[in-house]
Interface confidence: low
């Protein structure tokens, strides 16, 4: 029988009455247009809802928007449109919410055609009050907050000016013209590219990369011949045009652009691209597109400097057309990533890595599922996960995979079981061990969310028909109860719960349709009475992450250490609570060859842990460009994986000698870089 329908499932007592007392309906006094929702701050309970409605008139479109505020996690809303003078807010800019718990909000207003500049509404008290500010420019992008200081904002104008505010949008200053792209770095640094000859598009590949560390008082040109740039972890990347042809190469800096090294990655042509898939302070996953319109490329993983790269995964699906990739960081377990590959027969298959890209494997077949017709062998097949690519292809997949750092080990995703992704209607699968094993959780596509750090999972069936039923599970998706939250079904548009999965409230959004009108409606359900008591020590059990062979002394060792977690027992129906902190006990492992990646000039043959010298480099001195100097590498082929904490055991040696030769690789060498002040 389907999960949750067998007799062993313990029922949550009197849940209908408990949920009925904690279900709050709010009908919005709006015609149905679009609705956007933002949480303001963490654990504040403040939600802002912006509804917009366009009335097409004969000559122009008339817009109307309304702003609502809740301070009890969506149970009640108050119309605060008067706080923004009943102004029409531009939804394409969304609501710019400040970092952390700053309580800051910026709304960008629609202004009439002839105005000198745009208009914003600013709040620094969690949207209790707003201040109207007229801008000296028309914004092209949403206001961007500095991660370090929420009073510092930057924005690009429609005329490609870079504007900065130091007092939360009260006063603005244009610090540079002809800007294509701008990003905040660390320590309130701004990186941006500029064009010289007319436009961003015309100068692509001839842009300059600039840096200001003092909000526009002084500048430094840190790169030329730039195609694009990106920030990831502590790395600054730039793709730079080669001198002789139209190819580009990646250069990397770990000192905010003062010095650069050429990344040991393939160059790409005009139609290809690089993409930073994921980055942290230790390393980066980089996708390098294949030549031609193949829809795939190669994933490389970096060393700790972002310079030496190891091939991680071939034929990685990443469409050039829609820019879709299924690459997903499984945040509920360290080192786990899921993505898709395009196989030789053009079928799409899911791969998973448990060691940060060192090895990739297929997902294990769920025990309660059969292989579908895509499987050559009906007894041997894998689970294949639907993610961004499937969604872009309009398959019946309402949600991407879901994991939360504080719901340890839990991964929920749509999938199919076979040799490749199937276009049939998918089911929902769950893993409780970070992707090692999977179980079919729900039949057919659903929206799903995690509450109370995994204590509750909530799901709603994806249907074109109106719905009035929500499903919930208190045992990580094994058993399900259904609750009818309204007598009159609604056309469902989305599930909303506070980011971070600590809340016990879920909001169901949709609209009601009658003969003449349709209105937005939300139902907020608080599950606090379902989880009647706080969890105690006896409700938790010890779980060793990444455990595959309990007999093995090194069982659970990933990136040089193992972690034991305290996890909620599936049978315990209790509250983890908003203050729940994941309890983990790490222990260091002995080093093995698995803790080392292959150094520059070496590779790992398939199913082998040893690094072998690349045939074309045998007997050659290994020289490469580092910080603008030629380096000579003496190595036996191994380099410790970034973030690996192992000690003792195997210890391959390596040594880098400075050859005292220059190699600028067409990038500005440090001493030639120019500075200027305003």
């Amino acid at each position: 029988s389907a999960p949750g329908e067998d007799e062993e499932c313990g029922r949550v007592r009197d849940f209908v009455a408990k949920l009925a007392n904690n279900t709050h309906q709010h009908v919005f006094d709006d015609l149905r247009g679009s609705v956007s929702l933002s949480w303001v701050g963490d654990s504040t309970g403040v939600i802002l809802v912006l509804t917009t409605f366009h009335v097409p008139l004969v000559i122009m479109t008339f817009g109307q928007s309304k702003l609502y505020r809740s301070e009890d996690y969506g149970k009640n809303f108050k119309d605060i449109t008067d706080l923004i003078n009943n102004t029409f807010i531009r939804t394409e800019f969304g609501m710019a919410i400040g970092p952390e718990n700053s309580g800051k909000v910026v709304l960008t207003a629609e202004v009439s055609g002839g105005s000198r500049g745009g208009r914003i509404f600013r709040s620094s008290d969690f949207a209790k009050n707003f201040v109207q500010t007229d801008l000296p420019f028309h914004p092209l992008t949403q206001m961007m907050y500095s991660p370090q200081n929420s009073d510092y904002l930057l924005a690009l104008s429609t005329e490609n000016g870079l504007w900065v505010s130091k007092n939360f949008g009260g006063k603005w200053e244009e610090i540079h013209k002809a800007v294509c792209l701008a990003k905040w770095g660390s320590d309130n640094t701004i990186f941006f590219t500029t064009y010289a000859n007319g436009s961003c598009k015309a100068d692509l590949g001839a842009l300059e990369l600039w840096r200001t560390s003092d909000l526009g008082k002084s500048f430094k040109t840190i790169g030329v011949k730039i195609y694009s740039f990106g920030l990831g972890g502590r790395f600054l990347f730039a793709s730079v045009m080669a001198d002789k042809d139209t190819t580009r190469r990646i250069h990397v800096s770990t000192d905010q652009g003062d010095t650069w090294s050429m990344a040991q990655l393939p160059s790409v042509g005009q139609e290809q691209f690089y993409s930073i898939l994921a980055a942290n302070d230790d390393m980066v996953f980089m996708h390098v597109d294949e030549p031609g319109d193949t829809g795939f490329g190669t994933i490389f993983t970096s060393d700790d400097r972002g310079i030496v790269y190891s091939k991680s995964l071939d034929r990685h699906l990443y469409t050039t057309t829609g820019g879709e990739t299924d690459f997903t960081n499984v945040t509920s377990l360290r080192g786990v990533y899921i993505t898709s590959v395009l196989s030789e027969d053009n079928s799409i298959q899911t791969m998973i890595t448990f060691d940060q890209g060192g090895r990739w494997t297929h997902l294990r077949k769920p025990e309660n599922s059969e292989c579908d017709a895509t499987a050559k062998n009906k007894n041997e097949c894998s689970l294949h996960i639907h993610a961004s690519y499937s969604i872009s292809q309009k398959l019946n997949v309402p949600m991407a995979p879901l994991s939360e750092p504080n719901a340890v080990g839990i991964v929920i995703a749509h999938g199919s079981v076979g040799d490749a992704i199937s276009v049939m209607v998918p089911d929902v699968y769950i893993s409780d061990d970070g992707g090692y094993s999977w179980t079919k959780m729900l039949e057919g596509p659903h929206y799903y969310t995690i509450l109370d750090s995994g204590g509750i999972i909530v799901a709603i069936e994806h249907s074109s028909r109106p719905i009035n039923v929500i499903k919930f599970s208190t045992d990580e998706g094994q058993c399900w109860q259904t609750y009818t939250f309204t007598r009159d079904p609604i056309y469902f548009t989305g599930l909303a719960s506070e980011p971070g999965a600590r809340s016990m409230n879920i909001s169901i959004w949709g609209f009601t349709e009658s003969f003449l009108t349709s209105q937005w409606v939300s139902y907020t359900i608080d599950f606090k009475d379902i989880l009647e008591r706080n969890c105690e020590e006896k409700d938790y059990t010890i779980w060793l992450a990444h455990s595959t062979d309990p007999e093995d002394y090194e069982d659970g060792c990933i990136l040089g250490y193992k972690e034991q977690f305290l996890r909620l027992r599936k049978s315990s129906v209790c509250q983890n609570g908003r203050d729940y902190v994941v309890t983990k006990q790490p222990s260091i492992c002995l080093c093995s060859l698995e803790d080392f990646l292959c150094d520059f000039g070496y590779y790992r043959p398939e199913n082998d842990s040893k690094c072998v010298e690349q045939p074309e480099l045998k007997g050659h001195d290994l020289e490469f460009c580092l910080y603008g100097r030629e380096e000579h590498l003496t190595t036996n082929g191994y380099r410790k994986i970034p973030g690996d904490k192992c000690q003792g055991g195997v210890n391959p040696v390596r040594e880098v000698k400075d050859l005292k030769k220059k190699c600028t690789s067409n990038f500005l060498s440090p001493e030639k870089q120019n500075s200027k002040s305003n």
Partner: antibody
Framework: EVQLVESGGGLVQPGGSLRLSCAAS????????MSWVRQAPGKGLEWVAT????????YYPDILKGRFTISRDNAKNSLYGQMNSLRAEDTAVYYC??????????WGQGTLVTVSS | DIQMTQSPSSLSASVGDRVTITCRVS??????LAWYQQKPGKSPKLLVY???NIADGVPSRFSGSGSGTDYTLTISSLQPEDFATYYC??????????FGQGTKLEIK
Amino acid sequence: EVQLVESGGGLVQPGGSLRLSCAASGFTFNIYGMSWVRQAPGKGLEWVATISSGGIYTYYPDILKGRFTISRDNAKNSLYGQMNSLRAEDTAVYYCARHPGGAMDYWGQGTLVTVSS
Amino acid sequence: DIQMTQSPSSLSASVGDRVTITCRVSENIYSNLAWYQQKPGKSPKLLVYAATNIADGVPSRFSGSGSGTDYTLTISSLQPEDFATYYCQHFWGTPPWTFGQGTKLEIK
């Protein structure tokens, strides 16, 4: 061994109704999608309906929507097809097929439905 | 709806011949295509799924190829039991999952 056995076909007058059944054995019925496909005398194959493994999702071609209803009883390992408002052009052999994904991998022997006055 | 054009509609060949049947689709179906064989008075039998994968128990003389919008079923050396009608069917996206109109393979 996978077996699908259809029944319920026969002669019916235009405007009449008929209920087809398909008994499945030799595999775990409740984890497979199932389909009905028909073939008019001397003609090609025509897809009629599909139902998901748990019976939640059903699919029909536009020309048959409203006249054909597919259903299943997983406890009985059975697939059903309810045909209403039958017309002469519905005359065909009706096959039930196991439909796990990108193919229909096992088919029954078929049951003949004749619509004639 | 996706249109399927199967060709030829009929074909005469001799035992030992190499035979090719094609199926052209109105849009890219990303290899989500199956081939079936049907003998007179019998139910269809799955030969190939996902464009290139041979179903269990199907002789190795049958092979499927193609991608995008053009797909081919090949019989490398025709045997007496291969004379039948062959159908392609797509499984891309949402229904209807249309069949091709069929190719009747006859003895020359």
